[in-house]
Amino acid sequence: AGVFELQIHSFGPGPGPGAPRSPCSARLPCRLFFRVCLKPGLSEEAAESPCALGAALSARGPVYTEQPGAPAPDLPLPDGLLQVPFRDAWPGTFSFIIETWREELGDQIGGPAWSLLARVAGRRRLAAGGPWARDIQRAGAWELRFSYRARCEPPAVGTACTRLCRPRSAPSRCGPGLRPCAPLEDECEAPLVCRAGCSPEHGFCEQPGECRCLEGWTGPLCTVPVSTSSCLSPRGPSSATTGCLVPGPGPCDGNPCANGGSCSETPRSFECTCPRGFYGLRCEVSGVTCADGPCFNGGLCVGGADPDSAYICHCPPGFQGSNCEKRVDRCSLQPCRNGGLCLDLGHALRCRCRAGFAGPRCEHDLDDCAGRACANGGTCVEGGGAHRCSCALGFGGRDCRERADPCAARPCAHGGRCYAHFSGLVCACAPGYMGARCEFPVHPDGASALPAAPPGLRPGDPQRYL
């Protein structure tokens, strides 16, 4: 048994550009708190999988209000350590998740609102009893600096907290075969009292009263050798004549896993897969209770009154996850109109509107033509939230204030010459072409590509473009 301890040193903007905005403001003061989740081994499990080694919540930090115009500093932290007690052996390798939560203290309907600011995760090797290990983790633009250690609770000692120590019976030396307990030299290592009759050569125990067998041995006291010859049954005890295993009780018989845990056999013994909220060799330990307030965002905690019963969070509408820590993505329904950007603030949806649109859902098309005149007889046209002027002939530009040169775009084809005219432009076509823009070739036999020339016009005449 022992305790994992976590000390948060700082939480603030990381180095480099793009400093994050302060999570708190004068209008919405807030305070931080932290959650740590520990899992044995080097698993890369999802954040929602059980914290099989345990979990802890920090106290709330001091209330913080952003100073207008100031960059986000390191934020004020809660006092004290986060402590995660473990009942069994310390695994040596572990995975951690550290979450930074913000509690908003504004005028929230139904009490304060919580939101996850940052989550960091890692996998580490750590011997119990060692010095503090320092770490820096980054989550987006945020940086978290912390230290951690695992220490054994007396009488346990050792890198896994599995050796037990007792005060010396004699002042000078320990009993036969027992070593002094470093660093507590005035104490002696105490032998674990295994089940009576457990083979000292082929059996061992991690808890008092048990007898676990080394590979190759079986039976309640680990006195029966496992035969390697072909046998009908995979487990013993052995028949005296053949040395083969005959059907007998297996380690999972009777399901040693408590609290709904499922048992699977391992080469040495058995392993329990525990339901959420429980851990330990036999799922007998619950690290988090309803008293720890594990349900966020107004979730209702049910059960989990004591460490031996699981808790369940009943989430309010719009929240999900085993601790109600995740928000349902309401923006995926795209409630903002006219290309507005949807923001889910938890207590409300907000739309950031494109230029030319307004309203809670960007539903109002601003009248861009109001108070805007187009010069020289132009008319204002609304469209896409931006106004434009449809200009009278001979004028151009955003507000029709510029005189247009109708010949600037070289509208006359096939070498035709362009002349500006009060009503537009006139093309004088090169020989062999005709039409308003000189676009039609005249055929050699005198016929044109036009179905019929308008009366009074001969091929080659300047064509007025109206």
Epitope: R330, L333, Q334, P335, R337, L349, P360, R361, E363
Partner: nanobody, 119 residues
Framework: EVQLVESGGGEVQPGGSLRLSCAAS????????IGWYRQPPGKQRDMVAG???????TYAESVKGRFTISRDNAKNTVYLQMSSLRAEDTAVYYC?????????????WGQGTLVTVKP
């Protein structure tokens, strides 16, 4: 206050079809966006299909070509026609709506209806 009431859930075999309905009721409201979310056992709640604020239909990739959303504005009802159902479509299906009441917008959820797809 607006109530969303779902119906039409049930058990169906793989390849089968179901039609879910969501009826919105209340006083003096107008629907801005409305659609369907689903939450499989032990997983998170995600959007399946809906009418956006602009009135355009939107679908999750996993249901495109199999599910069709429609609406009856006169009845303030939205429907989800589900075809070629698969085991992974098993979930509680929730109706959700972004609703304008007076000058404010509010989000509402229905209680959900269970759809089970199994042989």
């Amino acid at each position: 206050e607006v109530q969303l009431v779902e119906s039409g859930g049930g058990e169906v075999q793989p390849g089968g079809s179901l039609r879910l309905s969501c009826a919105a009721s209340g006083s003096d409201f107008s629907i801005n966006a409305i659609g369907w979310y689903r939450q499989p056992p032990g997983k998170q709640r995600d959007m399946v299909a809906g009418f956006t604020g602009d009135g355009v239909t939107t679908y999750a990739e996993s249901v495109k070509g199999r599910f069709t959303i429609s609406r009856d504005n006169a009845k303030n009802t939205v429907y989800l026609q589900m075809s070629s159902l698969r085991a992974e479509d098993t979930a509680v299906y929730y109706c959700a709506a972004d609703v304008k009441i007076g000058g404010d917008y509010e989000w509402f959820w229905g209680q959900g209806t269970l759809v089970t797809v199994k042989p």
